[in-house]
């Protein structure tokens, strides 16, 4: 039976890398079989030499070399952009047009946005070599070379972020010549070589001067979570402080912070975090639902100045960001026991006030929910008839119920003499396993 054309396989965006030809695929159905023709930026391709395009019998377009295009700096498009290809499939009943596929060519420009600079660092302190790679398509990756060889990155000591190399603790062996290399499918570019010298810490003569520094911690503000960090980021605060005293002898500032304990209790130890700022900075990695104390300390090399005043901030509670763990269902005498383990501590997001337990519909229990208050991690539910019992559990903070656990099910047989909880070595059933068994 005759039918109009339909595109089955659309052409895909591609990078022309050469030296071999680029291929654009297009497949269509239809009766009579449709004829395929290709368009570039809406204009039909001639396919006649010197046109670099060639059509294969199956409708695939071969591009032997990149098509000619305007001056790269016409301001209308990047030189990467070779155009948009579409295919048309036609028979006597009509024409189908594919989605457009962009053909681009790999490019790596020569000019670095930021070149690494020569620097002197102190043993034990952190230092950063900045690098902003040239514009490239595809976007280039950055690697670092030291003394002519690729730098072996040590987790916890080296971090490459946004092109820059952060060295957590300088060692004498870090001395040398560093180079940032930007690479993509068009090739690679090398930055200038930056000389890094590492000095032993000085016996500072400024500590007396540093002791005269006064720091006023002015405010601590809870930052709005960055949507890019996902739905459940850890909270971060913005610290702002003022420095008075001698002319800026401090080389760096450290935040000291701890959770507040009950009045009269032994204070928690202060955690320390080096701040990336001289008057204000962000401090992350905190926990929701905690009361924190914050202060700031100036330092210069190994010398420390006096701590600032202490400011308090209560971080609001959030709902728990993980479900209770190890949820199990066990049969009892005319009852079913539900037990669980609290979510991991880092996911509490406040004080767990209790738990919510739901029974799921379409089982022997009608849909219902129970609230378990306090630290109790089990619940006994009365059962009146054989059949399947499925529950979910969620932890509750002052902000509400968090993420529920996966449904866990138990199948009670006729006389409730024994409960089927197959396969036994795998613990309770999931809803999926239960459905599969009931189907069998």
């Amino acid at each position: 039976q005759d039918s109009p054309p339909q595109i089955l396989v659309h052409p895909q965006d591609q990078l022309f890398q050469g030296p071999g030809p680029a291929r654009m695929s297009c497949q269509a159905s239809g009766q009579p079989p449709p004829t395929i023709r290709w368009l570039l930026n809406g204009q039909p391709l001639s396919m006649v030499p010197p046109d670099p395009h060639h059509l294969l019998p199956d409708g695939t377009l071969l591009l032997l070399q990149p098509p000619a295009r305007g001056h790269a700096h016409d301001g209308q498009a990047l030189s990467t952009d070779l155009g948009v290809y579409t295919c048309e499939a036609s028979n006597r009943l009509g024409t189908a047009v594919s989605r457009g596929a962009r053909l681009s060519v790999a490019v790596l420009r020569e000019d670095f946005q930021i070149q690494p600079r020569d620097m002197v660092a102190v043993v034990g302190e952190q230092f950063t070599l900045e690098c902003g790679p040239p514009w490239g398509h595809p976007e280039p990756t950055v690697s670092w070379w030291k003394d002519g060889k690729p730098l072996a990155l040590q987790p916890g000591r080296h971090t490459v972020s946004g092109g820059s190399l952060l060295m957590a603790r300088a060692e004498k062996s870090d001395e040398g010549t560093y180079m940032c290399v930007a690479t993509n499918s068009a090739g690679h570019r090398e930055s200038r070589a930056a000389r890094v010298s590492i000095q032993e810490p000085q016996d500072y003569t400024e500590p007396v001067e540093l002791l005269a520094v006064r720091i006023q911690l002015e405010n601590v503000t809870l930052l709005n979570p960055d949507p890019a960090e996902g739905p459940k980021p850890r909270p971060a605060v913005w610290l702002s402080w003022k420095v008075s005293g001698p002319a800026a002898p401090a080389q760096s500032y450290t935040a000291l912070f701890r959770t507040q304990t009950a009045p009269g209790g032994q204070g928690a130890p202060w955690a320390e975090e080096l701040l990336a700022g001289w008057q204000s900075a962000e401090l992350g990695g905190l926990h929701w639902g905690q009361d924190y104390e914050f202060k700031v300390r100036p330092s210069s090399g190994r010398a420390r100045g006096p701590d600032s005043n202490v400011l308090l901030l209560r971080l609001p509670e959030k709902v728990p960001s993980a479900p209770p763990q190890e949820v199990t269902l066990k049969p009892g005498n005319g009852t079913v026991f539900v037990s669980w383990v609290p979510p991991p501590a880092e996911n509490h997001n406040g004080i767990i006030r209790g738990y919510q337990v739901w029974s799921l519909g379409n089982t022997s229990l009608p849909p219902a929910n129970w609230t378990v208050v306090g630290e109790q991690t089990q619940l006994e539910i009365a059962t009146h008839m054989p059949g399947s019992y499925c529950v979910q559990v969620a932890a509750v903070t002052g902000a509400g119920a968090g993420e529920p656990s996966r449904p866990v099910c138990l199948l009670l047989e006729q006389a409730m003499e024994r409960a089927t909880q197959e396969p036994s070595e795998h613990g309770p059933w999931t809803l999926e396993q239960l459905r599969a068994t009931l189907k069998r």
Partner: antibody, heavy 118, light 112 residues
């Protein structure tokens, strides 16, 4: 036709936060680096931030480093500027602009006004 | 940071006459690869800036040929061969050779 439309400006108190958006259309957003530029009333233009086309590389002047974050969502053809710890001197019209390589800003949006005042 | 200065800061012009604006940088805008990244923009009253000249001397598409740019190192010039009424506004130079990118203070061009 290249179009850039900023939104999200408004009045905010010192120390507050604001998030600007820039909706792009008429070009393949994911192959262009993008920038934010601002202009305080009666003042010269000031470059605020730049982001590479894939979002890996970001650049800021010292005046906003640590307070402002530029980001992008290529699936939504949208550029963002998250501004924290705002100060009175951040009051300005904020423009988003398209970059050709890192050579020049060719198209600019109409701007959105941010006022930081108590 | 590189400081950009412009002169004059105000330029009253006569229609049909030529005009010239100077832009100076506190250090050379030539990078390691001998490339120069200096651009000129016009901001008409109540509008966003628009690109006129990129990389010292390249006219952006749609910009009339009465506009031309020249210069090297630290000294750059924008010339208008015959000023027209639509050319009024503030002209800015911008260097993007070195981060942070910096603008000149602007030159206000109006009709005498």
């Amino acid at each position: 036709e290249v179009q850039l439309v900023e939104s999200g400006g408004g009045l905010v108190q010192p120390g507050g936060s604001l998030r600007l958006s820039c909706a792009a259309s008429g070009f393949t957003f994911s192959t262009y680096a993008m920038s934010w530029v601002r202009q305080a009333p009666g003042k010269r233009l000031e470059w605020v931030a730049t982001i590479s086309q894939g979002g890996t590389y970001t650049y800021y002047p010292d005046s906003v480093k640590g307070r402002f974050t530029i980001s992008r969502d290529n699936a939504k053809n949208t550029l963002y500027l998250q501004m924290n710890s705002l100060r009175a001197e951040d009051t300005a019209v904020y423009y988003c602009a398209r970059l050709i390589y890192y050579d020049y800003l060719d198209y600019w949006g109409q701007g959105t006004l941010v006022t930081v005042s108590s | 940071d590189i400081v950009m200065t412009q002169s004059p800061l105000s330029l009253p012009v006569t229609l049909g006459e030529p005009a010239s604006i100077s832009c100076r940088s506190s250090q050379s805008l030539e990078n390691e690869n001998k490339n120069l990244y200096l651009n000129w923009y016009l901001q008409k009253p109540g509008q966003s800036p628009q690109l006129l000249i990129y990389r010292v001397s390249n006219r952006f598409s749609g910009v009339p040929d009465r506009f031309s740019g020249s210069g090297s190192g630290t000294d750059f010039t924008l010339k208008i061969s015959r000023v027209e009424a639509e050319d009024v506004g503030v002209y800015y130079c911008l260097q993007v050779t070195h981060v942070p990118w910096t603008f000149g203070p602007g030159t206000k061009v109006d009709i005498k």
